[in-house]
């Protein structure tokens, strides 16, 4: 199947280059314009002569300038200026500016909240399925393995530092050696990104809202997908995170520290402990092969106990059963032993929704994970309002150039690593990546902040999580101390490293654009974008985990053959785009391939009609359903009862879109199909209106 | 006070069998294991066997199995030791003894004997 | 079955002395040994269990010790009631067996 969504009917012929006419593209001089059918399956389209680039990116000449639809909206200011204002109306705007600050850090703090409580219904969820993951034998032998536990686990239990902690648990107690244990950290640091995915979601009521936050958001993830693919067989083959890690723990004499600070959890747990309250030692035990565990529920019961060891003694079947050779009798019809046992008795009830609703962890995970959502969904669609209401005119402007402005020449530089040292800080203070890209993502959808200062934004909180792995590594118990601290380094390094591939040199910031191009699918068929969400952090880790379960050799027998194609299919893509000459002329273009193998279009009809049955009645009550169901059916009618999305198709029916010049395109291999739309029309809708 | 009571002196005739009770009082009969011990003329002690009065588990010293019967009657809190096949040499006097179940305590309380003679 | 060896068979001595009765097991027991004491003509009574451990209302002066194979119930200073015959049992695997006894006599 071909990489991308539409590979283009570009014909490399030197005369002259036909394409068909998708959608809108940078502004460009006047080229001729013809008609022509491209495929015996569609209908006729308009061709267009394309420049001699050999290119597969759509060339569009349009009559009137459109913008690139990653260049940042202008936030215009329709309301009187301050100047302008009375003394009472100055007052009004000042107490009104006020109420909003209030409102804006009101719904910042439950969205906060409900990403919390979410981490915690995810965990109800599949916690204990988490657990059961970690306590795969193959996990030792078997990178691929470990790295696809990592992404699981974490997206299961919706937090790294979960995971994480299993992990260094695990180390501390022999179960795993810290070898197995950096691809599962490297996995972790993949699932973590699932979050701000999933915010990004939120955003799907406005196209080009969409596809900067989406963009935005999956930028983490590519970051992290990248690094993996570059730098696990790097650690396979030489080990150097281990070595390097190693070094470092055996140079210095550490001494327990203090606890690491809670900086942000301090102002949203007395919030969140009201709603439900975590046992995760469970999850741990789980990991560990405890049996009992498996039968104990995650919902924390007892907040007070009272812990006694005493000694008990237990009937063993002989002598050589005991525990110590010198506490060991018989009474002449059992033999007895004595055992250390720790009593634990239970003083008060922790004070939360669920304490005395005894439901199973599934029902009560479901439910969280249903209101979590809805209150992310809610918050999330009132900070955009909020924002996009304050930041409009000249206070946007500043905003926006404090924010994308690099610093002058020759520094200019230097900008992205301040912002990579802004997002490891900014992560340090609220001790979660997942909250601080979370909270980045809508900023980027609205226009705030480019996709290109949000990246070393990203990476510098990918920086800052490890830092407070680090410091909670450093407060941790004598035993667990070392390997804590080893597998933190290694976490460290590994995004350092990741960090030295794809950001220093411009040319190789593969994320951008990989996102970029994601962004520009999703837009285009927004329900790619939750099928790109289950492929890439479910299907894929479940199948890798499913083929190594059934032994290397089949893993091998199935993975290669994968990969050479996918390789086949890049070098294939990337001779197309840059020299197609050497090229047998069939394999110039995608075109030997049927319709469904390069394009989505065939697809989006499926799903449409899949979808079909919503679109007339799944929306009606309320507008946070709403978005759930313009992303399910990726057609705006399916909204109409609630007025929640204006019908866009129509209004872009029938439009023809002249001939254009090849502009520069952030990636050449997005494909015309996924660019192919004209935000203009769909620059704001009224699916983020309340 | 605790108190282990045995019946009273027996005589006889070998190949013939003899029961030897013993009433306890004074304290919870089923938390404690009653252990039958017996002493030859001028011999030291052999354990002959023990029963858990709570579920009438029991076990004996090899050499008495077949031979002897450990019973106890939760009702009355008395024990009980049938011992059939009577020889010569089975003449001693029978102890009853109490021993903490679960504990290490040893026999701590002892009836005060049972002479049971065999002679023809 | 655990042999228990004790000795001597018999000892003589005076009152205010010091006694030490010994006791060897076959076999390692821990510290599964208890210390009976009957007087003639009556049923014996539990002095020492798990060794060293007194039970109620044993005067201090006996005292026992060991682990392993080797034990001993000492007598720091004899008195004319103690006259009896001492039995030494181990508890560590059944059959529960006993020692043939020493008995301690005044001179």
């Known amino acids: 199947m071909a990489p991308w969504p539409e590979l283009g009917d570009a014909q490399p012929n030197p005369d002259k280059y036909l394409e068909g006419a998708a959608g809108q593209q940078p502004t460009a001089p006047d080229k001729s314009k013809e008609t022509n059918k491209t495929d015996n399956t569609e209908a006729p389209v308009t061709k267009i002569e394309l420049l001699p680039s050999y290119s597969t990116a759509t060339l569009i000449d349009e009559p009137t300038e459109v913008d690139d639809p990653w260049n940042l909206p202008t936030l215009q200011d329709s309301g009187i200026k301050w100047s302008e204002r009375d003394t009472k109306g100055k007052i009004l705007c000042f107490f009104q500016g006020i109420g909003r600050l209030i409102l804006l850090l009101g719904f910042l703090y439950f969205f906060v909240c409900s990403l919390d409580i979410l981490s915690s219904a995810f965990q109800l969820v599949g916690g204990k399925m988490a657990g059961q993951f970690f306590s795969n034998s193959s996990i030792m032998s078997n990178p691929l393995l470990g790295l696809v536990i990592g992404v699981l686990v974490t997206v299961l239990v919706q937090s790294s530092s979960t995971s994480t902690s299993i992990v260094v648990s695990m180390v501390s107690s022999s179960l795993l050696t810290v070898r197995a244990a950096i691809p599962i950290i490297m996995g972790a640091n993949i699932g973590t990104s699932i979050t701000n995915t999933i915010v990004a979601l939120m955003q799907v009521g406005d196209r080009s809202e969409f596809r900067r936050a989406f963009a935005g958001a999956t930028v983490h993830d590519f970051f992290n997908w990248l690094s993996v693919l570059v730098l696990l067989p790097v650690e396979v083959a030489t080990h150097y995170l281990e070595i390097i890690t190693q070094l470092i723990v055996e140079s210095f004499h550490f001494k327990n520290g203090e606890d690491a600070p809670d900086l942000l959890k301090v102002i949203t747990k007395p919030f969140t402990k009201l709603i439900v309250q975590l046992d995760k030692k469970v999850i741990s035990q789980i990991a560990m092969n405890d049996e009992k565990a498996k039968n104990k529920s995650l919902v924390k019961i007892w907040c007070k106990t009272f812990t006694n060891k005493t000694q008990i003694n237990v009937t063993v079947p002989s002598t050589a059963n005991c525990t110590s050779p010198s506490l060991c009798w018989t009474d002449g019809i059992q033999n007895w032993t004595m055992k250390n046992v720790t009593y634990k008795e239970n003083i008060a009830k922790c004070q939360h929704i669920f304490v005395n609703f005894h439901l199973p962890d599934l029902a009560v995970g479901t439910i969280l994970l249903i209101l979590s959502l809805l209150v992310l969904c809610g918050c999330l669609i009132m900070i955009v309002k909020i924002l996009g209401s304050v930041l409009k005119g000249q206070v946007a402007t500043v905003i926006k150039k404090t924010i994308n402005t690099d610093f002058p020449f020759p520094f200019a530089w230097l900008t992205g690593y301040l912002a990579i040292l802004v997002g490891a800080g900014m992560t340090f203070i609220v001790q979660s990546s997942s909250v601080f890209t979370s909270a980045l993502t809508p900023l980027i959808g609205i226009g705030v902040i480019t996709i290109e200062r949000a990246y070393p934004l990203t990476l510098g909180s990918n920086i800052g999580t490890t830092t407070t792995a680090i410091l909670a590594a450093l407060a941790s118990p004598g035993n667990a101390l070392r390997s804590s601290l080893q597998i933190a380094l290694c976490h460290f390094f590994f995004n350092i490293s990741g960090i030295l591939l794809w950001y220093p040199i411009p040319f190789t910031r593969l994320p951008i654009r990989m996102a970029k191009g994601l962004g520009n699918i999703s837009a285009k068929y927004r329900w790619f974008a939750v099928f790109y969400l289950i492929i890439f952090f479910f299907l894929i880790p479940l199948t890798v985990f499913g083929l190594s379960l059934a032994g290397w050799r089949v893993l091998v027998g199935v993975g290669v053959p994968v990969v050479f194609i996918i390789i086949l299919v890049l070098c294939l893509r990337l001779l197309q785009s840059r020299c197609p000459r050497v090229l047998p002329k069939k394999l110039q273009n995608w075109n030997f391939l049927p319709l469904w193998m390069r394009s989505l279009k065939p697809w989006d009809a499926v799903v449409s009609k899949f979808t079909g049955c919503f679109q007339m009645r799944c929306c009606c009550c309320c507008r946070v359903c709403c978005r759930a169901c313009c992303l399910l059916c990726d057609c705006p009618k399916c909204c109409r009862c609630s007025k929640c999305c204006e019908d866009l198709e129509e209004a872009q029916e029938g439009q023809d879109v002249p001939v254009k010049a090849p502009e520069t395109f952030d990636n050449i291999t997005i494909s015309r199909e996924a660019q192919g739309e004209v935000p203009a029309s769909d620059s704001k809708t009224e699916c983020t209106a309340l | 006070q605790v108190q282990l009571v045995q019946s009273g002196a027996e005589v006889k005739k070998p190949g013939s069998s003899v029961k030897v009770s013993c009433k306890t009082s004074?304290?919870?009969?089923?938390?404690?294991?009653i252990h039958w011990v017996r002493q030859a003329p001028g011999q030291g002690l052999e354990w002959i066997g023990g029963?858990?009065?709570?579920?009438?588990?029991?076990n004996y010293k090899q050499n008495f199995r077949g031979r002897v019967t450990l019973t106890a009657d939760k009702s009355t809190s008395t024990a009980y030791m049938e011992l059939s096949s009577l020889r010569s040499e089975d003449t001693a006097v029978y102890y009853c003894?109490?021993?903490?179940?679960?504990?290490?305590?040893?026999?701590?309380?002892w009836g005060q004997g049972t002479t049971v003679t065999v002679s023809s | 079955d655990i042999v228990v060896t004790q000795s001597p068979s018999s000892l003589s001595t005076s009152v205010g002395d010091r006694v030490t009765i010994t006791c060897t097991a076959s076999?390692?027991?821990?510290?599964?040994v208890a210390w009976y004491q009957q007087k003639p003509g009556k049923s014996p009574k539990l002095l020492i269990y798990?060794?060293?451990t007194r039970h109620t209302g044993v005067p201090e002066r006996f005292t026992g010790s060991g682990s392993g194979t080797d034990f001993t119930l000492t007598i720091s200073s004899v008195q004319p009631e103690d006259v009896a015959t001492y039995f030494c049992?181990?508890?560590?695997?059944?059959?529960?067996?006993f020692g043939v006894g020493t008995k301690l006599e005044l001179k």
């Open positions: 004074g304290f919870f009969f089923t938390e404690y294991i």
């Open positions: 076999q390692d027991v821990g510290t599964a």
């Open positions: 049992q181990q508890y560590r695997t059944s059959p529960l067996t």
């Open positions: 003894a109490r021993w903490r179940n679960a504990y290490y305590s040893a026999m701590d309380s």
């Open positions: 798990w060794a060293s």
């Open positions: 029963i858990i009065p709570n579920n009438d588990v029991t």
